[in-house]
């Protein structure tokens, strides 16, 4: 039943031989390899005109390999295909082609595009980030006493990066300006100049921004009429809501 | 579009013979080693047997070697599976497949059924 | 021959569930391993070959993955058309062997 390709080749060259080399197990002067010895793969090259039978170890570039009982054999893949499963089903082109669900193509389908990398189609992949973290406290110079206007922070992560033709990724960090009501540093947080500026004396600025709240205790003192005390309570509630409103508007992002 | 169809199951006595086919269509017949494949009732796939793409070599399962004859026409995309001998445990759907590593194309399946 | 061992014989899954199925080979078949999917009365149709790449039209929910002995196939979302027998064949060399089979139901 298993009438086998090599037998009926021998028959028609009278001329074979045992004493083979490079693997074949029994060979032709004209035909080369007609049968491989047990683990090598036979493929038959074409030279020319003639087809020459070769034992390897593995099939070359642009074949794949059969394990028959009795034969160990490559066949060739299709044109545009360096390695294949088999006819129908290429798993690496060759060089100008793109891989796509097993065939070789030249450019890649509408929706998809060329990984140059692996030379396979592959699907758009967009950015994607996560939700913002909650704003930073209000900061200056990495404090967050000992002034009136600093900026507060806000991040996020990217949970996916975007492939060439992806949609870009958003801003990972924003940056806003915030206006609080100054604080004095306690002993801990102020540093050596900071003490010596403050026994020095309070510039004007200074001066102009303190207020009887209970944040600037002690740094002023006068007495107030009720009339002027009023005036003064109107111009904190002004200033406040002035103050909320930049929060709201003031928005600077940053893209890392 | 491919096509594997097959024909000729039914119904016969144990030690009797049937004789199932397989007209190919919208592929190179003649390229495709090709493969009987069979599914016993509720039960898994098992290869049955395979013919070379140019007829010269078959290969067989040993339960059903010297029983089943495995044969091709190229000019006429056909697939022939002579079974002789049949025993109970032959009872299948046989389905007639392209066998080239894997079972690219497959047909809709032929019922043959061995009872006494 | 090369023994196919595939399991579990049979589950059921939930819409949207993750399942896997496995089969171990008897000896190294590097990554010469099939999947097919066999609905309810119809012939298998191939699902994936070279052990991870997918046949054309098949929905990227199902993946494969393995080499050497041990082989799976993983469905990212069952899907009420999932519902099927699964094989694993090896192709690494003749005879031909198919695993046992999986029937995945659904839940």
């Known amino acids: 039943q298993n009438a086998s390709r090599g037998r009926r080749q021998r028959r028609m060259h009278p001329n074979v031989s045992q004493g083979c080399q490079g693997g074949c197990a029994t060979c032709s002067d004209y035909n080369g390899c007609l049968s491989c010895k047990p683990r090598l793969f036979f493929v038959l090259e074409r030279i020319g005109m003639k087809q020459i039978g070769v034992c390897l170890s593995s099939c070359p570039s642009g074949y794949y390999g059969t394990r028959y009982p009795d034969i160990n054999k490559c066949t060739k893949c299709k044109v545009d295909c360096d390695t294949c499963f088999n006819k129908n089903f290429c798993t690496k082109c060759k060089s100008g082609f793109y891989l796509h669900l097993g065939k070789c193509l030249d450019s890649c389908p509408e929706g998809l595009e060329a990984n140059n990398h692996t030379m396979e189609c592959v699907s758009i992949v967009h950015c994607e980030a996560s939700e913002w973290s909650p704003w930073s406290p209000c900061m200056k110079k990495g404090k967050t006493c000992g002034f009136k206007r600093g900026t507060e922070t806000r991040v996020r992560d990217i949970l996916q990066h975007p492939s060439a033709k992806g949609n870009l990724c958003p801003p990972t960090s924003e940056t806003r300006t915030c206006i609080v009501q100054r604080k004095k540093c306690s002993k801990g947080e102020r540093g050596k100049k900071g003490r010596e500026r403050k026994r020095k004396k309070l510039n004007k600025e200074e001066r102009k921004e303190t207020s009887s709240s209970s944040d600037s205790k002690g740094l002023e003192s006068s007495i107030e009429t009720p009339d002027q005390q009023e005036n003064k309570e109107r111009q904190q509630q002004q200033k406040r809501r002035a103050r909320d409103k930049q929060q709201k508007s003031v928005s600077v992002s940053t893209v890392h | 579009e491919v096509q594997l169809v097959e024909s000729g199951g039914g119904s016969v006595q144990p030690g009797r013979s049937l004789k199932v086919s397989c007209a190919a269509s919208?592929?190179?017949?003649?390229?495709?080693?090709m493969a009987w494949v069979r599914q016993a009732p509720k039960k898994g796939l098992e290869w049955v047997a395979t013919i070379i793409y140019d007829g010269s070599r078959t290969y067989y399962r040993d339960s059903v070697k010297g029983r089943f004859t495995l044969s091709r026409d190229n000019t006429k995309s056909t697939l022939c599976l002579q079974m002789d001998s049949l025993r109970s445990e032959d009872t299948a759907t046989y389905y007639c497949?392209?066998?080239?590593?894997?079972?690219?194309?497959w047909g809709q399946g032929i019922m043959v059924t061995v009872s006494s | 021959d090369i023994q196919m061992t595939q399991s579990p014989a049979s589950l059921s899954a939930s819409l949207g569930e993750t399942v896997s199925i496995e089969c171990l080979a008897s000896?190294?078949?590097?990554?010469?391993l099939v999947w097919y999917q066999q609905k309810s009365g119809k012939s298998p149709q191939l699902l994936i070959y070279a052990a991870s790449r997918l046949q054309d039209g098949v929905p990227s929910r199902f993946s494969g993955s393995g080499f050497g002995t041990r082989f799976s196939l993983k469905i990212s979302g069952m899907q009420p058309e999932d519902e099927a027998d699964y094989f694993c064949?090896?192709?690494?060399?003749?005879?031909?062997?198919f695993g046992a089979g999986t029937k995945l139901g659904l839940k």
């Open positions: 000896e190294d078949i590097s990554n010469d």
């Open positions: 919208g592929f190179t017949f003649s390229d495709y080693d």
């Open positions: 497949a392209a066998h080239d590593r894997s079972f690219d194309y």
């Open positions: 064949q090896q192709s690494y060399k003749y005879l031909p062997t």
